[in-house]
């Protein structure tokens, strides 16, 4: 028993008209000691838990059930956990910024897409925000790989995307197929006008049946690509 | 225990290529983010960009787009930052940090102890 | 662009409690946690608060952190102040859960 209220020590209360250090009544505390009253500890209930058992000289803590999580200062309140496509910030969740994703259920934070670039692929399947994107095999690249950068969020950071070399390869590849096939007629052309007696029937049925025969190679680079239908000159 | 293990001090000329390195051990490389930030003589602290070890996917700070790259070898769980033209303005310290999968906007829960780059002629 | 402001410096004697402001200029400083970090010479970063409030083990009760909606800004307090305090302290933030951004940075005197 002490005669001042100042040398009391946390876990108790103390009353300037009657100056004696006593302990806090069960389920209250105080960190602080010589305070008049001791404060009612909290109760962790429903989507809560305790994290930390009350004291006589410490509150209790609380944290979310599972499948939740907590928001505000001390774990005020429980949010549901995120969804795949998000990720927890201070505000709840939030959709994966753009070229980020997030495939688990609950947990873990949006992360880049693939940089398919790295290993010398290609991107097969481009990514969302609850999926990665695909990478397809290597490939021979007929171009120097281009990059694009996307700002996501609008914020300065920028993310580093590897453009569809696939997508240029085709291009290129196809324009080839274009130019070669536009040079094979003009020189058709001038052998028909040099020599006419070669071609007998006229010259539209000769190249009919060549486009008919090369039908399947015309197409393919079509049909990689998700196109249909051959190539009319 | 978890530790951030950088590369040792750099000296370089104005408009060569440095490559830092922070080795990482004592948790799973591939599922955390790995920033890169710098602090000039007397400055502050600046974000340089980040890396994904899981994929290599990157993010750069405006300022360092296309002067910064950044890799990460998931068989030595050491993440690099190469840092190219460089200019007497670039005489830092850089450090490498790793932030917790908790939320998008954690802390930076362990620190490499920081590499010197010196850029002087 | 986003930026956090602190006061070049503070100082303040022994056994006295201190206060470091950190102004976000734009947006509001309730969508992103703020973290606190000091960093003595020639040392790393460490961190001393970090989503608003919280502290990591091993750091003194001392050391508090919040948060002001009204100023918009976050605080970090250390009372009973001793001189193994003296250092510079950072707060951090985010611009976007891609872009983390730091404010300027204090140099706490003890005196």
């Known amino acids: 028993v002490q005669n001042s209220c100042d040398n009391c020590q946390p876990g108790t209360f103390c009353r300037k008209y009657n100056p004696v250090c006593k302990s806090c009544p069960p389920s209250t505390f105080s960190s602080i000691g010589g305070q008049p009253n001791c404060n009612i500890c909290r109760v962790c209930a429903g989507y809560f838990r305790f994290k930390k058992f009350c004291s006589s000289t410490h509150n209790a803590e609380c944290e979310c059930i599972e499948g939740f999580h907590c928001l505000g200062p001390q774990c005020t309140r429980c949010e549901k956990d995120c969804r795949p496509g998000q990720e927890l910030t201070k505000q709840g969740c939030k959709t994966c910024s753009l070229g980020t994703f997030n495939d688990q259920n609950g947990t873990g934070v949006c992360r880049p897409w693939t940089n398919c670039s790295l290993d010398g692929r290609s991107v097969l399947k481009t990514g969302t925000t609850e999926k990665d994107v695909v990478c397809g095999p290597p490939v021979v690249s007929f171009s120097p790989s281009t990059t694009i950068s996307v700002t996501p969020e609008g914020g300065p950071g920028g993310h580093s995307l590897q453009v569809l070399t696939l997508f240029l390869a085709l291009t290129s590849a196809l324009l080839l197929a274009l130019i070669f096939i536009t040079l094979l007629f003009s020189v058709l052309k001038w052998i028909r006008k040099k020599f006419p007696h070669i071609f007998k029937q006229p010259f539209k049925k000769t190249t009919g049946a060549a486009q008919e025969e090369d039908a399947c190679s015309c197409r393919c680079p079509q049909e990689e690509e998700g196109g249909g239908g051959g190539y009319e000159l | 225990e978890v530790q951030l293990v950088q590369s040792g001090a750099e000296v370089k000329k104005p408009g060569s290529s440095v490559k830092v390195s922070c080795k990482a051990s004592?948790?799973?490389?591939?599922?955390?983010?790995i920033y890169w930030v710098r602090q000039a003589p007397g400055q502050g602290l600046e974000w340089i960009g980040n890396?994904?070890?899981?994929?290599?996917?990157?993010f750069y700070g405006e300022k360092f787009m296309g002067r910064a790259t950044f890799t990460a070898d998931t068989s030595t769980s050491t993440a690099y930052m190469e840092l190219s033209s460089l200019r007497s303005e670039d005489t830092a310290v850089y450090y490498c940090?790793?932030?917790?999968?908790?939320?998008?906007?954690?802390?930076?829960?362990?620190w490499g102890q920081g590499t010197l780059v010196t850029v002087s002629s | 662009n986003v930026m956090l402001t602190q006061p070049h410096s503070v100082s303040e004697s022994p056994g006295k409690t201190v206060t470091i402001s950190c102004k976000l200029n734009?947006?509001?400083?309730?969508?992103?946690?703020v973290h606190w970090y000091q960093q003595r010479p020639g040392s790393s970063p460490t961190t001393m608060i970090y989503?608003?409030?919280?502290?990591p083990d091993g750091v003194p009760d001392r050391f508090s952190g919040s948060i002001d909606s009204s100023s918009n800004s976050a605080s970090l307090t250390i009372s009973g102040l001793k001189t193994e305090d003296e250092a510079d302290y950072y707060c951090?933030?985010?611009?976007?859960?891609?872009?983390?951004?730091f404010g300027g940075g204090t140099k706490l005197t003890v005196l």
């Open positions: 940090a790793r932030r917790p999968d908790y939320s998008g906007d954690d802390y930076f829960d362990y």
């Open positions: 004592g948790y799973t490389f591939t599922s955390y983010y």
């Open positions: 890396i994904w070890p899981g994929n290599g996917g990157t």
């Open positions: 734009s947006g509001n400083i309730g969508s992103y946690y």
């Open positions: 989503r608003d409030d919280k502290r």
């Open positions: 951090h933030s985010y611009d976007s859960t891609i872009t983390p951004v």
